[in-house]
């Protein structure tokens, strides 16, 4: 009896795992084995597919084959007993295009009201994603074990912290990876559950702010209790995307180690140009708080987000305000290569009633003024990046008198 070729061959690729599955054509025939050949693009000869020769089951693994994952390959299969079936050719495919992203590895750290999530690719040093390893983003689904109400969080990086949770509560989550550049969405990790801890008697420091004074940065925060010591740590912000990097390590700011006040001062040259994350922890000698929420700190914006400089042209019913680049010491203008938004406050000199204008433009009209009246104006700049959310201090107030009633044009 002629053996029939196997049918319905499926190729499953997850990360660097290459699995073939197929259907037997004739279930009634026993002791049949199956073998595969493969052929690379541009080659005429077929090569035996190692790991998939004389297989008795309907599944085989050819992960050991070192393929160029961007190169198209073709497979064929036949059944064998005393004789052999004809070959059944599988549609050619490119491994990278066919591959799915496997479930990531997840490590959780519990705080009382937060969970830190560390995510890494499920296959270490994957060949399939070798060129894309740093492009992974992740999404997760989290729920309280007791309620099952799911919350989705999209577009997170390899380290993510979820805040505003309840103490002593079990939360469960699952994570999947995505390669947005290749339109690939991965497989969810197994569900990981962790219980948040008892509430820490020492809350984390809050409202961390950085300002510049002379050649120093001044870092300030709020704290509930007195007689505490604090430590401050920093991390390059870009490393959040890549904790596998050996540089991924929170480091102490030397001048902010074991400080006894709710602020610390350190030289600007501690940080090279860049964007950093800062966090603060409190201790009373016996107990230690969890880390504060991290703040983003951009040295360029921090150092150079100076109050705007402006000129006023006075008319009878309005001011025209022309905003220029702020001046550094030495009277050189500061080049600001990030978008700013300006907040202009003005008030009648004899009154405390302030009015506000928010403008993106550098020429602003302040309308509806009374003639021959002294108005005062101050301004400050804000970054338009919500994440950085920095503001300069207000400029000194400038006071001008509006013109008489007939000079509005």
């Amino acid at each position: 009896k002629n053996l029939k070729s196997p049918q319905k061959v499926e190729v499953d690729i997850i990360d660097d795992n290459f699995i073939l599955r197929w259907n037997r054509s004739d279930e009634s025939v026993g002791n049949v084995t199956f073998s595969f050949d493969y052929q690379k693009t541009g080659m005429d000869n077929w090569i035996k597919l190692s790991g998939c020769q004389n297989i008795t089951s309907t599944k085989c693994n050819f992960s050991s084959l070192k393929l160029n994952v961007y190169e198209e390959i073709k497979l064929r299969i036949r059944a064998e007993k005393e004789n052999t079936s004809s070959w059944y050719e599988v549609d050619s495919f490119t491994p990278f295009r066919k591959a799915q992203i496997g479930p990531p590895e997840v490590h959780l750290e519990a705080e009382d009201k937060a969970i830190v999530i560390h995510i890494s690719p499920g296959t270490k040093d994957s060949v399939m994603w070798a060129l894309d390893g740093l492009s992974f983003t992740y999404s997760l689904v989290i729920w309280k074990n007791s309620s099952g109400v799911e919350e989705r969080i999209e577009n997170i990086y390899s380290r993510h912290k979820i805040y505003k949770l309840s103490p002593e509560t079990t939360y469960c989550l699952k994570v999947k990876a995505a390669l947005l550049t290749s339109w690939k969405i991965g497989v969810y990790s197994p569900v990981h559950c962790i219980k948040t801890t008892v509430e820490n008697e020492l809350p984390p420091p809050e409202n961390i702010e950085v300002s510049v004074q002379n050649q120093n940065y001044v870092l300030k925060w709020d704290y509930t209790y007195a007689n505490m010591t604090f430590q401050v740590q920093w991390l390059h912000a870009f490393l959040k995307r890549n904790p596998g990097n050996h540089l991924y390590k929170w480091k102490q700011i030397p001048d902010c180690e074991n400080v006894k006040t709710t602020q610390c001062v350190f030289p600007q040259n501690v940080f090279q140009k860049g964007i950093y994350l800062l966090r603060v922890q409190a201790s009373d000698g016996n107990n230690t708080s969890f880390w504060s929420e991290e703040i983003k700190f951009d040295t360029e914006i921090q150092a150079f987000l100076l109050p705007p400089v402006f000129n006023i042209r006075s008319l009878s019913d309005s001011f025209h305000i022309y905003i220029g680049a702020p001046k550094q010491s030495g009277n050189t203008p500061v080049i600001q290569d990030y978008p700013l938004i300006y907040e202009i406050i003005f008030w009648e000199n004899t009154s405390n009633a302030e009015r506000k204008i928010i403008e993106k433009k550098t020429d602003v009209t302040v309308p509806n003024l009374k003639p021959l009246t002294v108005y005062c104006v101050k301004a400050r700049a804000h970054t338009m990046d919500e994440k950085l959310n920095k503001s300069s201090v207000f400029s000194d107030a400038v006071c001008e008198k509006t013109k008489p009633g007939n000079t509005s044009k």
Epitope: H107, E109, A110, E111, D112, V116, H118, R159, I194, K195, T197, V198, N200, E201, P243, G244, H246, L247, Y248, K249, W250, N286, N287, T288, F290, W291
Partner: antibody, heavy 123, light 107 residues
């Protein structure tokens, strides 16, 4: 698979120093803290200190701070623990043990241990 | 330093028994607690971390519970290979500290 292989047993005189090595394999050496723990005969476990192999940052148990030196040779993925001014009560088995990832926010348990090195201090 | 107090210090039990070992810390350690098993002449082996999470490859008869200052290791049904000394360890504050150990012997 992760392996920590320690150097062999040592016999030292009081006042001398001993240097124990711990060679790591099977994982990214610079991504995890390496800890040292000792155990005197018939006694419990005592944490001595830890080192970050990527930049040699160290943390010590105050009890050992003045006598222990932890060093790293990244080229051979080896960590060394040197204990000076030895006394008879330093007779113990010394273990290296892998700690948490350096990227973790908080410290972690010791998941892999070396086989131990017996150091005997005797005149 | 945080003191870790384990009880009992020794315990006799039979194969199939359910056994519980407790560990108390002098300060709250926020679930930063590990349990280790040590057999004579061998290095300790991690069983449980984060107070409740079973290390991979460890049989499911081992379980951990507790929070705050009070933690427990339970072996649901003792097997012959479980007779050993068990240590708890806190890793919330440096220096990390261990309990004095619980020796589990065959009755």
């Amino acid at each position: 698979q992760v392996q920590l292989v320690q150097s062999g047993a040592e016999v030292k005189k009081p006042g001398a120093s001993v240097k124990v090595s711990c060679k790591a394999s099977g994982y990214t050496f610079t991504s995890y803290w390496m800890n040292w723990v000792r155990q005197a005969p018939g006694q419990g476990l005592e944490w001595m200190g830890k080192i970050d192999p990527s930049d040699s940052e160290t943390h010590f148990n105050q009890k050992f701070r003045d006598r222990v030196t932890l060093t790293v040779d990244k080229s051979t993925s080896t960590v060394y623990m040197e204990l000076s001014s030895l006394r008879s009560e330093d007779t113990a088995v010394y273990y290296c043990a892998r700690g948490g990832r350096i990227s973790f926010d908080y410290d972690a348990a010791l998941d892999y241990w070396g086989q131990g090195t017996l150091v005997t201090v005797s005149s | 330093d945080i003191q870790m107090t384990q009880s009992p210090s020794s315990l006799s039990a039979s194969v199939g028994d359910r056994v519980t070992i407790t560990c108390k810390s002098s300060e709250v350690i926020y679930n930063r607690l590990a349990w280790y098993q040590q057999k004579p002449g061998k290095a300790p082996k991690l069983l449980i971390y984060g107070a409740t999470t079973l290390e991979s490859g460890v049989p499911s008869r081992f379980s951990g519970s507790g929070s705050g200052k009070d933690y427990t290791l339970t072996i649901s049904s003792l097997q012959p290979e479980d007779f050993a000394t068990y240590y708890c360890q806190q890793y919330w504050n440096k220096p990390f500290t261990f309990g004095q150990g619980t020796k589990l012997e065959i009755k």
